[in-house]
Interface confidence: low
């Protein structure tokens, strides 16, 4: 054996974001032949041997970070990258806008404008179909998710959440969905690359928008990811996925 | 049963600051969030702001900001909301009320009557 | 902030007639709506929540209805206990505004 046992995958089924007393498995999944699983839930004292947790209702104590490992032999494997199983319709949900309207022209720029009744302050805008958000520290009590020069494959449905950073796997409901109509073009998201461009973040602290843009313009199932924003005066690029900006009280 | 228990009336004068409780009991105090609103007779409910004392977040209404503090302590389970530079225009009843998953406020306290007057 | 305009300020109503309030958002709050009665001397109750789910022990001569900007509060068949100021609520967007009330009066 050269170098430590290759990291499992694990996944929540059907998704990580679970509405609470909503079932949800989390499967641990390494290579044939595994001797043992241990799945654990990361900042508490609780694992098991198993491949799979099944848990029938959601509740708030299980929303958390999880991971897996496996063992073969006397050898442990590399952990998997950590699960963050989140509860959802803990809160009410936020409502979801789009400035200046939800139908806007192939070019053209729009804002989703996530808002919450709640002093919470972060969001996650999620695009129906993509499998991951963009999260967004809060202005006041909303968000803007800026898109700028859209296309054909930012058409779609729009769903945003609110929570808090000091309990971040506890979310809203979601938003009513928001449909965004893009005209004026005949390119469709079929046509799309299938190799994701990097993704910039911007972080603008006198206005508190999350400026996501793209080296070709596009806004894709697979540039669909979460987004760390950093303050602008920080010298440090956006950090990895998961990781929250917090705006200072 | 849900209860919250807020003092009757409070005299204060102009310029001072009063600081308003509100005990909660029957429920778990830190699930829920606890608003405060004002009433003056014949011009309605005004929502203050609230707060969630598990996590101390809080939000205000901006016409509010400048003059009530919202805090908790959750060892005796009381919200308190402190008013500060008192006017005649902030004479009136102030309530505390909670809410919990949804934002409708269910349990309301019986509200404390504030009179600013030298 | 969003302004909820509640209409008749006062009803004069007879024991046993059917009350209609309605409230006007100055835009759209999907349903998120609540009303609720205040008795003199005492702290507003919520009766509705949702602009249509009636809280628990609420007796279900009170309905709500409504969507968008136009919310609509009834009693089917008022009784005397029912005299109290009604408000409506919205807490789609913050600050939370209210209406301004509607007394309702027995005769």
């Known amino acids: 054996q050269s170098g430590p046992l290759p990291k499992p995958s694990l996944q929540a089924l059907p998704s990580s974001l679970v509405p609470l007393e909503k079932p949800v498995t989390l499967r641990c999944q390494g290579p044939p032949g595994v001797d043992l699983y241990r799945l654990e839930k990361l900042s508490s004292s609780r694992y098991q041997d198993q491949a799979v947790l099944f848990i029938p209702a959601m509740k708030r104590s299980l929303a958390g970070r999880y991971r897996c490992s496996y063992q073969n032999g006397s050898l442990w494997s590399l952990p998997s990258d950590q699960l963050e199983l989140v509860a959802t319709g803990v809160f009410a949900k936020p409502s979801l806008s789009a400035q200046p309207g939800p139908a806007v022209s192939s070019g053209g720029d729009v804002t989703l404008q996530c808002q919450t009744r709640y002093g919470f302050d972060q969001f996650a805008l999620y695009k129906e179909g993509d499998p991951a958000p963009y999260k967004n520290p809060e202005r006041w009590y909303r968000a803007s998710f800026p898109i700028i020069t859209v296309t054909a494959a930012h058409s779609g449905t729009y769903r945003c959440y609110s929570f808090s950073s000091r309990d971040p796997y506890l979310w809203s409901a979601p938003s009513d969905p928001l449909e965004l109509v893009v005209t004026g073009t005949s390119v469709t998201p079929s046509r799309l690359p299938t190799e994701p461009p990097s993704p910039v973040a911007e972080f603008s602290e006198a206005t508190a928008e999350l400026t996501v843009s793209f080296t070709n313009e596009v806004f894709t199932t697979e540039t669909s990811r979460s987004i760390t924003a950093s303050p602008k005066e920080s010298d440090s690029p956006a950090g990895p996925a998961r990781q929250y900006y917090t705006k200072g009280n | 049963q849900v209860q919250l228990q807020q003092p009757g009336a409070e005299l204060v004068k102009p310029g001072a600051s009063v600081k308003l409780s509100c005990k909660a009991s029957g429920y778990t105090f830190t699930s829920y969030w606890m608003h405060w609103l004002k009433q003056r007779p014949g011009q309605g409910l005004e929502w203050i702001g609230m707060i969630h004392p598990n996590s101390d977040i809080t939000n205000y209404n901006e016409k509010f900001k400048n003059k009530a503090t919202l805090t908790v302590d959750k060892s005796s389970s009381t919200a308190y909301m402190q008013l500060s530079s008192l006017t005649s225009e902030d004479s009136a009843v102030y309530y505390c009320?909670?809410?919990?998953?949804?934002?409708?406020?269910?349990?309301w306290g019986q509200g404390t009557s504030v009179t600013v007057s030298s | 902030s969003i302004v909820m305009t509640q209409t008749p300020k006062f009803l004069l109503v007879s024991a046993g007639d059917r009350v209609t309030i309605t409230c006007k958002a100055s835009?759209?709050?999907?349903?998120?709506v609540a009303w609720y009665q205040q008795k003199p001397g005492q702290s507003p109750k919520l009766l509705i929540y949702y602009a249509s789910n009636r809280y628990t022990g609420v007796p279900d001569r009170f309905t709500g209805s409504g969507y968008g900007t136009d919310f609509t509060f009834t009693i089917s068949t008022v009784q005397a206990e029912d005299l109290a100021v009604y408000f409506c609520?919205?807490?789609?967007?913050?600050?939370?505004?209210f209406g301004g009330g509607t007394k309702l009066e027995i005769k």
């Open positions: 609520q919205q807490d789609y967007s913050s600050p939370p505004t």
């Open positions: 009320a909670r809410s919990g998953d949804y934002y409708a406020m269910d349990y």
């Open positions: 835009q759209s709050v999907s349903n998120d």
